[in-house]
């Protein structure tokens, strides 16, 4: 009679974490008499996974009735697979004796475990940045296996190319993590923009995971200022407006200065929103011209989102007919008030 062979038909088996793994093993003969044992690994450090004869193996069940006399199928099912179960499993036939002796081994089945990556988490810079600046976004996902994974970056649906990705650890592990850093150049139109990190893995069946970051949390669009003198509303009164345009975020404080002295400070409240997500705001001053002998320099000074103040000035001619004139100046703040100036915003 032909000598018994131990057949493990599957060279490799891949199972998703949490599922059961079936490891197939058949023998070609009932002789010699003796039990089957399953091991993970080989050599002196191999681990016993199942012993047909004795022992308690709560995660292992036999696929067929291995206790039947004529049974030659010693396939097993291992439940609730985790990445730590990966390895090569050997079905080994023993010859009955005192003690039982190893008779023949199967060629082994390599079990690999597929584990899904966690939802990608995208984080941006700690501080806001202005248009034309390059900012870095990071994307992290953990717990996946096998190691092969694809990560892509998008900004508003357009794929980005300036990024660096690392999969850790470099060596072998039961599961892996991915970390990627992308560089994004901000534009003034980015308030409504999104940065997306997309992770594709064999466990996701072609349906990648995405993590997003809104550039509204990253960008700061500084305002443009325009100071204009409106037609005289009443004799001796001039209306001067400061148009604060295209700023983001909304946090903004405006100070009017008359000849360098603070006349009024207000905080942007009733702003209007532009299509691109930036804001506009207007503040006005009613100046009593008759109260002034000399020309008046009116300055609109704006502090946006905690940044250094920017300002725009307007020279109000008292002696002659008022004419519009604007220039950027360094901001003064003497803190004095002027009763002859009235203001408002809208």
């Amino acid at each position: 009679e032909e000598e018994l062979q131990v057949i493990q038909p599957d060279k490799s088996v891949s199972v998703a974490a949490g599922e059961s793994a079936i490891l197939h093993c058949t023998v070609t003969s009932l002789i010699p008499v003796g039990p089957i044992q399953w091991f993970r690994g080989a050599g002196p450090a191999r681990e016993l996974i199942y012993n047909q004869k004795e022992g308690h193996f709560p995660r292992v069940t036999t696929v067929s009735e291995s206790t039947k006399r004529e049974n030659m199928d010693f396939s097993i099912s291992i439940s609730n697979i985790t990445p730590a179960d990966a390895g090569t499993y050997y079905c080994v036939k023993f010859r009955k004796g005192s003690p039982d002796t190893e008779f023949k081994s199967g060629a082994g089945t390599e079990l690999s475990v597929r584990a899904k990556p966690s939802a990608p988490v995208v984080s941006g810079p700690a501080a806001r940045a202005t248009p034309q600046h390059t900012v870095s976004f990071t994307c992290e996902s953990h717990g996946f296996s096998p190691r092969d994974i694809t990560l892509k970056w998008f900004k508003n649906g357009n794929e980005l190319s300036d990024f660096q990705t690392n999969v850790d650890p470099v060596g072998e592990s039961v599961s892996y993590s991915i970390h990627s850093t992308a560089k994004v150049v901000l534009t003034r139109e980015d308030v409504h923009s999104q940065v997306i990190c997309e992770v594709a893995h064999v466990t996701l069946q072609g349906d990648p995971l995405r993590g997003t970051a809104n550039l509204s949390e990253t960008i700061r669009v500084p305002p443009t200022l325009e100071v204009t003198q409106q037609p005289v509303r009443a004799e001796n009164q001039v209306n001067v407006t400061c148009q604060v345009r295209k700023f983001y975020p909304q946090r903004l404080q405006l100070t009017w200065l008359e000849n360098g002295n603070v006349s009024r400070t207000e905080t942007a409240s009733t702003v209007t929103e532009n299509k691109d997500g930036t804001y506009n705001w207007m503040s006005w001053l009613l100046v009593n011209v008759s109260a002034h002998r000399d020309d008046v320099k009116l300055t609109c000074q704006v502090e946006h989102d905690g940044q250094p103040a920017v300002s725009k000035s307007h020279d109000l001619k008292v002696s002659a007919h008022p004419k519009e004139q604007g220039s950027n100046t360094a901001a003064e703040n003497t803190g004095s008030n002027e009763r002859n100036i009235y203001g408002g915003s809208g």
Epitope: A42, G43, P44, E102, K104, S105, A107
Partner: antibody
């Protein structure tokens, strides 16, 4: 092609600890035993011990009290620490890969590092 | 521990001629599966050892077929059918049945 590279100090003072690291490149840690073997000047090969990918270790009984082998699969490295060294520990130290296909024994030490000379001297 | 004993310890050879090295183990290296846990290694001058034969008779990858291993139980032989100049060095037998792994003292092969 799997390659092994030993690294560590070439000179160790008596009574101090010898520390060597072996970096595995171009292959898998899994399903192999990772061994340290030494060769004193002009003498034969002496097995120090090995570690399996599952973390189990085996040591030469005469060295067991002084030797620790550890494995860092995340870096594809394994290490040897030998405490209380004496001049008798002067040798070329090899790291090596031992195959295990099935059964209780092993199937040959098939990949060797180039060896690193360690001298124990004050 | 299993003790491995080689003979001869020195072997002068002539290129083109055959050569033979013996190795004896203090206990059988034949496992119950029928597998023999005996390996042969060659250490060329100034180099690391390299595996020639494993399992008593299986040639390792890239090893020329002029090398062959035989024997079972406790007595083993490494044969070189035609010695070449590059075969000079020290040949070791080693057992891999149980820990500690042990090696023979080595046989130094040199050209006559």
């Amino acid at each position: 092609q799997v390659q092994l590279q030993e690294s560590g100090p070439g000179l160790v003072k008596p009574s101090e600890t010898l520390s060597l690291t072996c970096t595995v490149s171009g292959g898998s840690i899994r399903d192999y035993y990772w061994s340290w073997i030494r060769q004193p000047p002009g003498k034969g090969l002496e097995w120090i011990g090995f570690i399996y990918y599952n973390g189990r270790t085996f040591y030469q009984s005469s060295l067991k009290s002084r030797v620790t082998i550890s494995l860092d699969t995340s870096k594809n490295q394994f290490s040897l620490k030998m405490t209380s060294v004496t001049a008798a520990d002067t040798a070329v130290y090899y790291c090596a890969r031992v195959r295990a296909y099935s059964g209780i024994g092993l199937d040959g030490t098939d990949v060797w590092g180039q060896g690193t000379t360690v001298t124990v001297s004050s | 521990d299993i003790v491995m004993t080689q003979s001869p310890l020195s072997l002068p050879v002539t290129p083109g001629e055959p050569a033979s090295i013996s190795c004896r183990s203090s206990q059988s290296l034949l496992y119950s599966t029928g597998y023999t846990y005996l390996d042969w290694y060659l250490q060329r001058p100034g180099q690391s050892p390299q595996l020639l034969i494993y399992g008593g008779s299986s040639r390792a990858s890239g090893v020329p077929d002029r090398f062959s291993g035989s024997g079972s139980g406790t007595d083993f032989t490494l044969k070189i059918s035609r010695v070449e100049a590059e075969d000079v060095g020290v040949f070791y037998c080693g057992q891999a049945l149980q820990t500690p792994l042990t090696f023979g003292q080595g046989t130094k092969v040199e050209i006559k």
